[in-house]
């Protein structure tokens, strides 16, 4: 039996700059029941606070609701482990909510097969930013990627689309069914998960009244 090992805060994420969660790895428990607490202070303040919500984001986590989240302040966060034999603390982690945003995937992915005047066909991929993202006001600047592949293929073909929420893909195989997904990344944050797959079959012979 021994004091607990050093815990480690291994991830903090915000879906929208308005709330965030931090998760920790507990470290060894020293063979004894061990209690964990997350404490934090804010840039320029002496006061130390305890995690407002240990439940919402699951085990070994702390959820900061809107009431506790500010993008104007750096959070200095520590996890403390305590058992009968002693205690240990993680290294303090400095968290700027601007830099931990991982948004929800884009929505409304639509696929349309189109034809140019020269009879060349292409796939027109369109989508919308994630629901919570206030892109219009510049609160978020979002970049996007799409990926697609024939249904049976292993490898995805990835296209970076910048800030565009539509993209035209040329030179696809007639008669093939393609799977398409999209994802987004805010200017300083992390890529979202890939969206749910949409699929489209490229026609063998294409005639369109445009």
């Amino acid at each position: 039996q021994s004091p607990p090992g050093k815990p480690e805060i291994h991830k903090c994420r915000s879906p929208d700059k308005e709330t965030f969660t931090c998760w920790w790895n507990p470290g060894t428990d020293g063979g004894l029941p061990t209690n964990y607490s997350l404490t934090y202070s804010k840039e320029g303040e002496k006061t130390t606070y305890e995690c407002p919500d240990y439940k919402t984001s699951g085990p070994n986590s702390c959820f900061f609701s809107k009431q506790y989240t500010s993008i104007w302040k750096i959070y200095i966060i520590t996890v403390n482990a305590t058992n009968q034999m002693g205690s240990s603390s993680s290294d303090p982690l400095y968290v700027d909510v601007t830099y931990i945003v991982e948004p929800e995937p884009p929505r409304n992915l639509t696929l349309e097969v189109k034809q140019l005047k020269d009879k060349k066909t292409y796939l027109w991929v369109k989508w919308s930013p994630p629901t919570i993202t206030d892109v219009k006001t510049g609160w978020f600047t979002m970049e996007y990627e799409i990926r697609l592949k024939p249904e049976e293929a292993e490898e995805w073909e990835i296209h970076f689309t910048g800030h565009q929420t539509q993209f035209k893909v040329f030179d696809l195989y007639p008669g093939q069914k393609y799977l398409v997904q999209t994802r987004c990344k805010p200017d300083h944050g992390y890529w979202s998960r890939w969206s749910q797959e949409s699929s489209v079959e490229m026609p063998n012979d294409f005639t369109l009244k445009d």
Epitope: H10, C12, E43, G44, W72, V95, T98, Y99, H188, Y190
Partner: antibody, heavy 118, light 112 residues
Framework: QVQLQQPGAELVRPGTSVKLSCKAS????????MHWVKQRPGQGLEWIGV????????NYNQKFKGKATLTVDTSSSTAYMQLSSLTSEDSAVYYC???????????WGQGTLVTVSA | DVVMTQTPLSLPVSLGDQASISCRSS???????????LHWYLQKPGQSPKLLIY???NRFSGVPDRFSGSGSGTDFTLKISRVEAEDLGVYFC?????????FGGGTKLEIK
Amino acid sequence: QVQLQQPGAELVRPGTSVKLSCKASGYTFTSFWMHWVKQRPGQGLEWIGVIDPSDTYTNYNQKFKGKATLTVDTSSSTAYMQLSSLTSEDSAVYYCARGDYSNWFTYWGQGTLVTVSA
Amino acid sequence: DVVMTQTPLSLPVSLGDQASISCRSSQRLVHSNGNTYLHWYLQKPGQSPKLLIYKVSNRFSGVPDRFSGSGSGTDFTLKISRVEAEDLGVYFCSQSTHVPWTFGGGTKLEIK
């Protein structure tokens, strides 16, 4: 505790390439972005670029695009920077540096001195 | 790119004196989120740089309170109230509001 280990020095020929390593320990490697910084002898610091080890997303200083390539090996918790077409201008100390979830450098490697010489 | 200009280049001081280093940026350093990402690092001889001050005026963990930062917009200052021998080295200001992140040329604090 967090450590970033870099080899002390590399001597390389002009026109060749070199791949510098930065072995991370004491934290979850894929959780934090890794930056690279250049320091020429007796001069200031230049930010080269950053890589997110969780998905290998990179962002480069325009000045170093084509010169530096950042990669990671998550199985060994090691970040790499390859420098190509080396000239005497590339002779410098190169640091890897980790931020927290912030945009400054909290932890630094000891730096690798690259000397480009015929 | 944002150019960071530090003055003086060299600052000879006596131990116990106050030291002041200036840093001027070629663009305002207020980020779109309202924060000002101006930081100060100290590089001691033969070592890698260490963070002293983040976001203009916040001392990093373990940094003595004789170090203080101030400023706004494009003009920033680092002050050391009573210089100690362990403070000697090269001080760099750095901005991370605009990509690419850039550094000042450094100010060498040395004993008079």
